[in-house]
Structures are given as C-alpha cells and as structure tokens.
C-alpha cells in the first residue's frame, strides 16, 4: 500500500508583509516525485499551476511562484497543493500576504523578515468552491 501524500508547506520570500510594487515569491514544498504544484488564492477561486519543480533536498521538492510587482489586489490568503500522480495532496495551511504602502523611513524595513515562528498561516478549510482556472497576476518563476 503506497503511503498517503504528506501535506505541503508554503512560505513567502522575502516575507509576508510586502511593500506595494515590490516582489514576492511563494515557495511550495512537498515530497519528491511531485509533477505539479498549484498555488491557490482565497480558497480555490484563483490558482496557478507549475510543472517547474526542483529538488530542494533528497526528500523534498519545491516550486516557486513569483509576483514581480505586488499590488493591493494581491493581498489575501494563499495555499499550496500538489499533484503526485495519480492523485492530489491535501492543501497546505493558508499563508496571508499583506501589502503595505512604502513608507521609506529608516526604522521601517521594507519587508517583514521570516521568523522562526514562520509566516502568518491560518488552518486550511475543507470547503470546495468552484474554481476558475485563471492566474490573475501569478506566474511561475522559472529557475533555469
């Protein structure tokens, strides 16, 4: 019996609080053998798939989704799910992306650095809304 698929994780680089116009990269991680990672926004209303999967470690693979210039509309909840044929994993926890006006002050860093506690996450729900296959500002970051 093959084991059930481990739950993916999600993080954001350089952090989860991003100044308007800056870039952010969502990093989805799962086991080796993943064919497709999907980054979902606000449950399943918007998503983007990538097959540009790299091996992060001997036991882990990852995919990166980059937004070059963050807008206010990019703020929201994001989560990852992956497809390791022939089935999908469960969803990761939610990660909340916050977009702030650039203040430019010396005492206010541009981004919130990742802490040991990890990014802001909310437990994923089990609702299954209809999804619309639209990327809306998300694109796969090609690593090659």
């Amino acid at each position: 019996q093959e084991e059930d698929l481990p739950r993916p994780s999600i993080s954001a680089e350089p952090g989860t609080v991003i100044p308007l116009g800056s870039h952010v990269t969502f990093v989805c991680r799962g086991p080796v053998g993943v064919q497709t990672f999907r980054l979902e926004r606000d449950s399943r209303s918007t998503y983007n798939d990538t097959e540009d999967v790299s091996q992060a470690s001997p036991s882990e693979s990852e995919a990166r989704f980059r937004i070059d210039s963050v807008r206010e509309g990019n703020a929201g909840l994001y989560r990852c799910i992956y497809y390791k044929p022939p089935k999908w994993s469960e969803q990761s926890d939610y990660l909340e992306l916050l977009v702030k006006e650039s203040s430019g002050g010396p005492d206010s860093p541009d981004t919130e650095p990742g802490s040991s506690a990890g990014p802001t996450q909310r437990p994923s729900d089990n609702s299954h809304n209809e999804h619309a296959p639209a990327s809306q500002g998300l694109k796969a970051e090609h690593l090659y």
Epitope: D4, P6, Q35, E51, Y83, P85, P86, K87, E90, H131
Partner: antibody
Framework: QIQLQQSGAELARPGASVKLPCKAS????????LNWVRQTTGQGLEWIGE????????YYNEKFKGKATLTADKSSSTAYMELRSLTSEDSAVYFC????????????????WGQGTTLTVSS | DIVMKQSPSSLRVSAGEKVTMSCKSS????????????LAWYQQKPGQPPKLLIY???TRESGVPDRFTGSGSGTDFALTISSVQAEDLAVYYC?????????FGSGTKLEIK
Amino acid sequence: QIQLQQSGAELARPGASVKLPCKASDYIFISYGLNWVRQTTGQGLEWIGEIYPRSGHTYYNEKFKGKATLTADKSSSTAYMELRSLTSEDSAVYFCARRSVFYDYDKNGFDYWGQGTTLTVSS
Amino acid sequence: DIVMKQSPSSLRVSAGEKVTMSCKSSQSLLNSGNQKNYLAWYQQKPGQPPKLLIYGASTRESGVPDRFTGSGSGTDFALTISSVQAEDLAVYYCQNDHSYPFTFGSGTKLEIK
C-alpha cells in the same frame, strides 16, 4: 460537446506495429490526463497507461511496458498509443478516456470515453 | 496491484426492484489526507464505452439519475439502484482510481426479467 474521437477499426499483421489516435475536442486538452484502456472478453477492462499532455509525462501498467507507447500532440489535441510486436493476443477494443482529477481534485474516474477502436491482429 | 472483486457476477431482477451490487478492494482506496475515496462506478451497455456513474465512491456524475447511489469507504463499496428500469440493462464496473495501475472489477451483469 466534449468528444474523444477514435478510429473505428484497425487490421494489422502479426509482428507489425499500429498507432491508434484519439482526438479530443471542446475541452482544454493539456488540463486533463488522457488514459488508454483495453477491453477483451477474457480479461475485461485493463488500464494500459496515462499521459499528461502538458508535460508529456507518462505512467504505464507494468504489463504493457514495452508493448504500448503513449504520446500526445498538443497542437492538434490528439493523443496516440502505439502498439508494437503485435500478436493475436493484442486483438481487443482500445478506449481512450479522460481523467479529470488533474483539473479538478474533487473528482476522479474517467468522465469521457472514446467509442473505442477495434484492433484485429491476423495474418 | 490493487485487486477489485465484484459480486455477484450477474443479477436478474424485475423492473421496479431495488438492487445492490458489491465491490471490494484489496487495499484501502481512502486517501486519509483529504478523506476522499478514489473509487468510481461505470455502466457499460452493449456496443458502447463505459459511462461514469459515480466517483469518489458516492458522488453522482452530472446527469446520472438519482436512483443510482454509491456508498462505502476504505475497501468495501456498493452501488444501489433504487428502482431498476429497463434501460439499466448493462454491466457495472467498479474501478480503483487511487493508485497506479488503475484496476477494474470484473463487472456485475444486470439483466431484466
């Protein structure tokens, strides 16, 4: 409406190869897995393999490795299965079928099927 | 490989009767991560390809009459037709959609008296 079109019948000689087409229409070809299933009176329904047209990734039933090769042409939304070194044992109906779980992870199973190609291997 | 066993191999019933057929898998088809059973049921009429009736063990495919009901979880599944109609004459197959290689049961042939 969504369709998977297959050639109705094929006749081949023992030892030859045959390439069976399956043309998809009215859906996004690269967003779904495309599977091949064989039906014989003796063995019932047997899964041969699956191809993901976006990437070309293929997954085979061990039993059909070396016998079947799956390919897909994204430009024409057509999947192909080549069967080689044919024998009378390969005489069967071959179906292509769409598996929608890759598009919609709440769904599984084969939701659309072609009408099937009847392959007869005879000298 | 996951082995799918269907019973009975054939059923002969009168129109209007309720009928239940069984499907047992040699391994669990439940993905504990998302609590989904990767089990599908098909109806195949003579000269036609199989038609998807039920997926996820219990979800009716769009357009399938509500007299068809799928149930079960893990390794034991059933398909029930609440009131058999003449047009239900067919062979019914269950299928493992959980793990490669996908496997089918040998079918239950439904005959109408």
